[in-house]
Interface confidence: low
């Protein structure tokens, strides 16, 4: 992008930033009129995120970013996120000393919970390279929720599609058997956790996204909010990810993709997640932003504050 264009863009994004009361969480809606004059959304961003259409079945207004970082990283629309926007600093300070407060919220929508279970089952089926039948899925959903099956399946399919890049495909139009189509080109992420199995590797990009959108550090509570949206709960073993808490606080930390640190002088101790050195070495904020844009069917411009930060990082790195 020419220098003059970059500085104009930056000035425009600064104006947007001034309107953005809660940094990174309550991202203002980008209207279609604004969109036309935002060159970043058509020509400057590599990776084709800009041309991506909204993920099937996700009811979003044009270019609206989800209201929480967790919702953005999970690729769910703002209407579905459990929490409304909060002051970023307030959320940091109010966050509890342990993740336990945020997990298994008793008031959580049971359909969301069921779709989480279905995602878990579908990922397991994908992992063992087996097709899945409607009957098997109905068993997971249970008799009580059978009438809500279409809605639950739709939610599960969205989660599967936007986070893991897997599409459920009917074997024939009238059939009750589904296979999986892997629609994401892994070349972008091949260095990230290349020795890990597919679904676990796929969690890393959105986790990095949650951290980035939360001002480059995310509390345990914020991370669990995101994982809960995928049907992954603290203290509950997951058939694909194993022990989620171990995955995020041990495996990814030991592999240097995440840092897990005590919030300075917090008493009782509170913990936060940061990007680790390998995350900085093997991906970038811009790539993560493009990923988030892709899963939300929008463009990096929908996250103006973060787009500006990512641009600065690219410039520093001489990209």
């Amino acid at each position: 992008m020419p220098r003059g264009q970059k500085s104009k863009l930056r000035a425009r994004e600064k104006r947007r930033k001034a309107r953005d009361e809660t940094r990174g969480l309550n991202v203002p809606q980008v209207t279609e009129a604004e969109e036309e004059e935002a060159p970043c959304c058509s020509s400057s961003v590599s990776g084709g995120a800009a041309s991506s259409s909204p993920a099937a079945g996700i009811p979003q207004e044009p270019q609206r970013a989800p209201t929480t970082a967790a919702a953005a990283a999970a690729g769910v629309s703002s209407t579905k996120s459990k929490k409304g926007a909060k002051s970023h600093q307030g959320e940091k300070n109010a966050s509890s000393s342990q993740a336990s407060t945020s997990t298994k919220s008793p008031s959580e929508d049971p359909l969301t919970r069921k779709s989480g279970s279905l995602v878990q089952f579908l990922l397991y089926k994908y992992k063992i390279k087996k097709s899945v039948t409607k009957g098997e899925m109905l068993k997971i959903v249970g008799k009580r929720f059978r009438e809500h099956f279409p809605e639950i399946l739709k939610k599960a399919s969205e989660g599967l599609s936007v986070v893991f890049g897997l599409e459920l495909n009917k074997v024939n139009p009238n059939g009750h058997t589904y296979t999986f189509i892997d629609k994401v080109d892994l070349t972008d992420e091949e260095s990230l956790l290349s020795s890990w199995d597919f679904p676990r590797r796929k969690l890393l990009m959105p986790l990095l996204g949650v951290i980035f959108l939360n001002g480059n550090s995310a509390t345990e509570e914020e991370i669990w909010e995101f994982l809960n949206m995928l049907g992954v709960y603290d203290g509950e073993e997951h058939s694909v990810f194993g022990e989620p808490w171990k995955l995020i606080t041990k495996d990814l930390v030991q592999e240097k993709y995440l840092e897990y640190k005590q919030v300075p002088s917090s008493d009782p101790p509170r913990f936060q997640f940061l990007w680790g050195p390998r995350a900085y070495a093997e991906t970038s904020k811009m790539k993560v932003l493009e990923f988030l844009a892709k899963v939300n069917g929008t463009t990096p411009c929908a996250f103006p504050t973060h787009y500006e930060e990512a641009l600065k990082d690219e410039e520093k790195a001489g990209v």
């Epitope: 022990e243 171990k246 041990k250 495996d251 005590q262 913990f271």
Partner: antibody
């Protein structure tokens, strides 16, 4: 889902023994598997753990050198024990940890001449 | 190795009463502490992990608290079925490479 220990029994002092922990209904890929022992009428004592994601092994300071933990397949982890003495007589448990633990019923190892 | 000191060694209480068990770590383990219940001839059963969250299926009569080096398990509205030996267990802080998975000496709870 379950874990089961095998390989326990009577062994002579200074002898060796290998215990096996077998997982049913899941693979060990994403977990720590740990060995813990309990002498008759005594408390629990940690021996060693293996992180099956990366193969890293961890030992209690007293267990280093005499005990070796290793993964032998996607569903089995072994504990090799050497130079056994009467003090090693105990029920040996394998456990999947940490916040979603699963314990086997234990296998009794008796060191006696 | 980190030393876990559990007190008391044994405690007796009536049905409906309350029992408090303390566990002290020789150095800070942040919130990396679990509580287990063990009955004779059985493997230990997890009650609480990471200092305070209840494991699945554990009644809310069991409460864990504390952080750093001092931890407490409180059992209220005691039932006969709560008679058992209770162990605290620490595990490593993932920000260090020192993995530790050690147990306290155990506390026998007698319900009369």
């Amino acid at each position: 889902q379950s874990l089961e220990e095998s390989g326990g029994g009577l062994v002579q002092p200074e002898g060796s023994l290998t215990l096996t922990c077998t997982a049913s209904g899941f693979t060990l890929n994403n977990y720590y598997i740990c060995w813990v022992r309990q002498a008759p009428g005594k408390g629990l004592e940690w021996i060693a753990c293996i992180d099956n994601v990366n193969g890293r092994t961890y030992y209690a300071s007293w267990a280093k050198g005499r005990f070796t933990i290793s993964r032998t397949s996607s569903t089995t982890v072994t504990l090799q024990m050497t130079s056994l003495t009467a003090a090693d007589t105990a029920t040996y448990f394998c456990a999947r940890s940490l916040s979603t633990p699963l314990w086997g019923p234990g296998t009794l190892v008796t060191v006696s001449s | 190795d980190i030393v876990m000191t559990q007190t008391p060694f044994s405690v007796e209480a009536a049905v409906g009463g309350t029992v408090t068990i303390k566990c002290q770590a020789s150095q800070s383990i942040s919130s990396y502490l679990s509580w287990y219940q063990q009955k004779p001839g059985q493997p230990p059963k997890l009650l609480i992990y990471r200092a305070s969250p209840l494991a699945s299926g554990v009644p809310s009569r069991f409460k864990g608290s504390g952080s750093g080096t001092q931890f407490t398990l409180t059992i209220s509205d005691l039932e006969c079925a709560d008679a058992a030996t209770y162990y605290c267990q620490s595990y490593d802080d993932s920000s260090s490479n020192n993995f530790f998975y050690g147990f306290g000496g155990g506390t026998e709870v007698v319900v009369r």
